[in-house]
């Protein structure tokens, strides 16, 4: 996973929605202990903006040496900075922990832009604000970088917390939460609430402000609005979803469904934008601009790179479109939608023009790697990661940002045929999705 | 080829309204691929942006000069307007207006100014 | 907000020989820099776009160059005609609305 901005066909068919309510999450269904209801201290547990990141603070060590960690649902290595770095205010040191043990064997880790490499151990790990337990974990230790670090981020390290498939050096590095799981009693799920400010925020208010929360073995309740709605876990590797409609202000794309999910579409908290494949970003933002044609905006602004500013408070939302991603359902022939406003997909930027105005970047990008439905869909909803049942679920954010007029919204049920023709089938050679 | 003529009145007592148009000829004002903007100059001084407009009326002002600044734009008559109330000497200025081109990040064609003076 | 600062503000030279004029941004504006020309008693004239392009009828000895924070503009040789004052102009942040505060090129 890029943190930062990173980091033969068929089509599927949206319908109108069904009379009858499909299965998906009550209060009636069977569910481990512990897994619902209200999660006190690990709400709010995390800091942080969409550009640069969100982390949760963990311990590392004995006696314990806290760090800030950047949360990141796109790849699997626990990983942190153990080396003095000119952007880190403070790094794991390995010599002064008496539980590290040192496994000897070293980690490379590229990436498109920038890479990490490191030495693998094992040490204690625990979340002062997550379950009340410690677990033995294995950590890679950051020795050298290059573009990994963000400036002003406050966080040293990662929690990748995707499954072994895709860890470094390979799968026979246990993830940090397949040893949570596996040492301790905490349920095989946990859900995210990113909340995205609405506004830029310079270094004091971000260090200063709520970012979200990550629920650790469980769902609370008073982190969304209206039903949870559950998609298949598609191969767990990423955590992999199929997309089979795409909608602009309820135009649909009318693409090949398969379109979507060229190689993969994954749920990234580590990726800033909606990344979407080359074909379907052209024609999505071909889309977006006749919808808000009232308005002409330069190439740059397209392509995430110029900033368009408004007065303060007077930026037009209503000019630009919703955005609707069909999911495949839980029940064969049935979808659901999830819906972001443009609150969502553009993103505000600091520092760059005066106080009286309002800066955006726009938060959608072309990928080359499938679909990466980054932090600009993610502010928008709680989401869950029901490893246990190898589902994601979506509900409506409680802190998403919206106007008076319109709100994010996950609705269902649709009947959708073919949704399996819709996943795309990656040929097989190694590692050949890694370098993402 | 497309040029633009600024024109108005060249003195302006204090506290009044100063008002320009700009007059695009070899062009349309109602082209979807610019914006229309109007820059000025203090005498010896630097450029100094007002704000732009686009086809539909959609405005953008400096942030300094926003309480008093209107842009309009009229494509039946191929022409965009300037209206700066409450002017004080300080207002006095070369005013240029521009097109915005190059992917409407630029002004790639100018008129040739008018010299406004604010005095009683 | 994005400064920009050109320097020096003024550069005494003779023609034939090379000038190399200056914009620093207080911040990264990417590419997204101009260059405009502006003799006396008339209007500026866009020179150069997105920090190296060359407008429509502008001579090859002017030549733009850099990117980030850094940026440069050379006529590789002077002739009569260019000395002027030059502004450069930012549109990281639409619409374009930043101007440096301009460096005079005077015959030495």
């Known amino acids: 996973t890029q943190h930062g901005i990173r980091l033969p066909l068929r089509s599927g068919l949206g319908g109108a929605p069904l009379g009858l309510r499909l299965p998906r999450e009550t209060d009636e269904e069977p569910e481990e202990p512990g897994r619902r209801g209200s999660f006190v201290e690990m709400v709010d547990n995390l800091r942080g903006k969409s550009g640069q990141g969100y982390y949760v603070e963990m311990t590392v060590g004995s006696p314990p040496q806290t760090l800030n960690i950047l949360v990141d649902t796109g790849s699997s290595n626990f990983a942190v900075g153990a080396a003095p770095h000119p952007f880190l205010h403070r790094y794991y040191q390995r010599q002064l922990s008496s539980t590290y043990r040192d496994l000897r064997k070293g980690v490379y880790v590229p990436y498109t832009q920038g890479k990490w490499e490191g030495e693998l151990g094992t040490d204690l790990v625990s979340i002062p604000h997550g379950p009340n337990v410690t677990v033995r974990a294995n950590i890679a230790a950051i020795t050298e970088s290059d573009k990994f670090f963000i400036n002003g981020s406050n966080w040293e390290g990662i929690l990748g917390l995707a499954y072994a498939e895709i860890a470094r050096p390979d799968d026979s590095l246990e993830p940090f939460f397949d040893s949570l799981v596996k040492q301790t009693h905490v349920p095989n799920l946990f859900s995210l609430q990113l909340c995205g400010a609405g506004f830029p925020l310079n270094q004091s208010e971000v260090l200063a402000s709520v970012g979200g929360s990550m629920i650790i073995g469980g769902i609370d309740h008073s982190l969304y609005t209206g039903s949870l709605w559950y998609t298949p876990i598609r191969r767990e590797w990423y955590y992999e979803v199929i997309i089979v409609r795409v909608e602009i202000n309820g135009q649909d794309l009318k693409m090949d469904c398969k379109e979507y999910n060229y190689d993969k579409s994954i749920v990234d908290s580590g990726t800033t934008n909606l990344r979407l494949p080359k074909k379907v970003f052209e024609a999505a933002v071909k889309s977006i601009k006749a919808a808000s044609s009232t308005e002409k905006f330069p190439d740059g602004f397209w392509l995430g790179e110029q900033l368009v500013c408004w007065q303060a408070g007077t930026t037009p939302w209503n000019i630009f479109p919703v955005i609707s991603l069909y999911l495949m359902g839980e029940v064969t022939n049935q979808s659901f939608r999830i819906t972001i406003l443009p609150q969502q997909y553009l993103r505000p930027v600091e520092d760059v023009a005066t106080s009286q105005d309002d800066c955006y970047k726009f938060a959608i990008s072309q990928s080359s790697t499938g679909t990466v439905m980054g932090a600009v869909i993610m502010e928008g909803f709680y989401v869950v990661f029901d490893r246990a049942r190898k589902r994601i679920g979506f509900a409506v954010s409680a802190c998403h940002v919206h106007d008076e007029f319109r709100t994010a919204a996950v609705e269902g049920p649709f009947v959708t045929l073919d949704m399996e023709d819709c996943g795309y089938n990656i040929p097989q050679t190694d590692e050949s999705t890694l370098m993402t | 080829q497309l040029q633009l003529q600024e024109s108005g009145p060249g003195l302006v007592k204090p506290s009044e309204t100063l008002s320009l148009t700009c007059t695009v000829s070899?062009?349309?004002?109602?082209?979807?691929?610019?914006?229309w903007g109007w820059i000025r100059q203090p005498p010896g001084k630097g450029l100094e942006w007002i704000g732009s407009?686009?086809?539909?009326?959609?405005?953008y002002y400096n942030p300094s000069l926003r309480s008093r600044v209107t842009i309009s734009v009229d494509t039946s008559k191929n022409q965009f307007s300037l209206k700066l109330s409450s002017v004080t000497a300080a207002d006095t200025a070369v005013y240029y207006c521009?097109?915005?081109?190059?992917?409407?990040?630029?002004?790639?064609?100018w008129g040739r100014g008018t010299l406004v003076t604010v005095s009683s | 907000e994005i400064v920009l600062t050109q320097s020096p503000a003024t550069l005494s030279l003779s023609p034939g020989e090379r000038a190399t004029l200056s914009c620093r941004a207080s911040?990264?504006?990417?590419?997204?820099l101009a260059w405009y020309q502006q003799k006396p008693g008339q209007a500026p004239r866009l020179l150069i776009y997105?920090?190296?392009n060359r407008a429509t009828g502008i001579p090859a000895r002017f030549s733009g160059s850099g990117s980030g924070t850094d940026f440069t503009l050379t006529i590789s040789s002077l002739e009569p005609e260019d000395f002027a004052v030059y502004y450069c102009?930012?549109?990281?942040?639409?619409?374009?609305?930043?101007f440096g505060g301009g460096t005079k090129v005077e015959i030495k």
């Open positions: 521009a097109r915005v081109g190059h992917g409407i990040s630029y002004f790639d064609l």
């Open positions: 102009q930012q549109s990281l942040t639409w619409p374009p609305r930043t």
């Open positions: 407009i686009y086809r539909s009326g959609s405005t």
């Open positions: 070899g062009g349309s004002t109602s082209s979807s691929s610019y914006y």
């Open positions: 911040q990264s504006v990417s590419s997204y």
């Open positions: 997105d920090a190296s």
